[in-house]
Amino acid sequence: LRCHVCTSSSNCKHSVVCPASSRFCKTTNTVEPLRGNLVKKDCAESCTPSYTLQGQVSSGTSSTQCCQEDLCNEKLHN
């Protein structure tokens, strides 16, 4: 499996060949109003998708996307 593995304030791309144990490409997108943004893309052995975790706007929102095809975590999906 090949995934994008990178960390940035916005969408980023850096393709790598994942370890054999990795079955997922994972993207975590965290947005905090005062604190900024963080996009983390990685290879993952397991992955649980989530979309809206926080209740308060002031706490920001975090989402996790999972996919299982080569370079499938290229784009950010809101």
Epitope: S8, E32, P33, L34, G36, N37, V57
Partner: antibody, heavy 117, light 110 residues
Framework: EVQLVESGGGLVQPGRSLRLSCAAS????????MHWVRQAPGKGLEWVSG????????GYADSVKGRFTISRDNAKNSLYLQMNSLRAEDTALYYC???????????WGQGTTVTVS | QSVLTQPPSVSGAPRQTVTISCSGS????????VTWYQRLPGEAPKLLIY???LLHSGVSDRFSGSKSGTSASLAISGLQSEDEAEYYC???????????FGGGTKLTVL
């Protein structure tokens, strides 16, 4: 070129007011939270205030709460800090800074000096 | 008194490695990422390291960051004269609801 330019500093008497401005260029201003950070003479950096991209979230350091007001005008690519009831301990070099990556100020201005005396 | 604690000064000879420590608490470094800034004389602070150990674009890989528990450190290898500067650690503080800084460490290259 990504740039932040502060202005509005100067010498002011205790109890008076001052308004700082920060002009942003080279990036999409209304995509990012912005902050004011200061450095008093011989001291370290101190966060003063921050404002989210749409002004929906605003924060202040306890030391300035109730005296300072942060605001922004996205149409003018500008950030402001209204400073009232100034004290001697507010004397510092004031920087505006852009928050891009989580919890990191990735762009800083050169600063504007405020002297309360 | 700064919320995060750094040594006021460190020094090292050219080509040596120096480490700057940063100590916090469970409400800041223990829960949130650490950022490091460099402030050269007469210049604005510059982002070096974010998210504990990630190098900002354009920063030399002689700089590296690490974190363990409520403490963090910045290592500078292959010291050069142009590394003479003040270095600040920072983290978000959940109790204060804002970013907090260390008092700064002045690095002298002997």
């Amino acid at each position: 070129e990504v740039q932040l330019v502060e202005s509005g500093g100067g010498l002011v008497q205790p109890g008076r007011s001052l308004r700082l401005s920060c002009a942003a260029s080279g990036f999409t201003f209304d995509d990012y939270a912005m902050h004011w950070v200061r450095q008093a003479p011989g001291k370290g950096l101190e966060w003063v205030s921050g404002i989210s991209w749409n002004s929906g979230s605003i924060g202040y350091a306890d030391s300035v709460k109730g005296r300072f007001t942060i605001s922004r005008d996205n149409a003018k690519n500008s950030l402001y800090l209204q400073m009232n009831s100034l004290r001697a301990e507010d004397t510092a070099l004031y920087y505006c800074a852009k928050t891009g990556i989580l919890d990191a100020f990735d762009i800083w201005g050169q600063g504007t000096t405020v002297t309360v005396s | 008194q700064s919320v995060l604690t750094q040594p006021p000064s460190v020094s090292g000879a050219p080509r040596q490695t120096v480490t700057i420590s940063c100590s916090g608490s469970s409400s800041n470094i223990g829960q949130n990422s650490v950022t490091w800034y460099q402030r050269l004389p007469g210049e604005a602070p510059k982002l070096l390291i974010y998210y504990d150990d990630l190098l900002h674009s354009g920063v030399s890989d002689r700089f590296s960051g690490s974190k363990s528990g409520t403490s963090a450190s910045l290592a500078i290898s292959g010291l050069q004269s142009e590394d003479e500067a003040e270095y600040y650690c920072a983290s978000w503080d959940d109790s204060l609801k804002g970013p907090v800084f260390g008092g700064g460490t002045k690095l002298t290259v002997l």
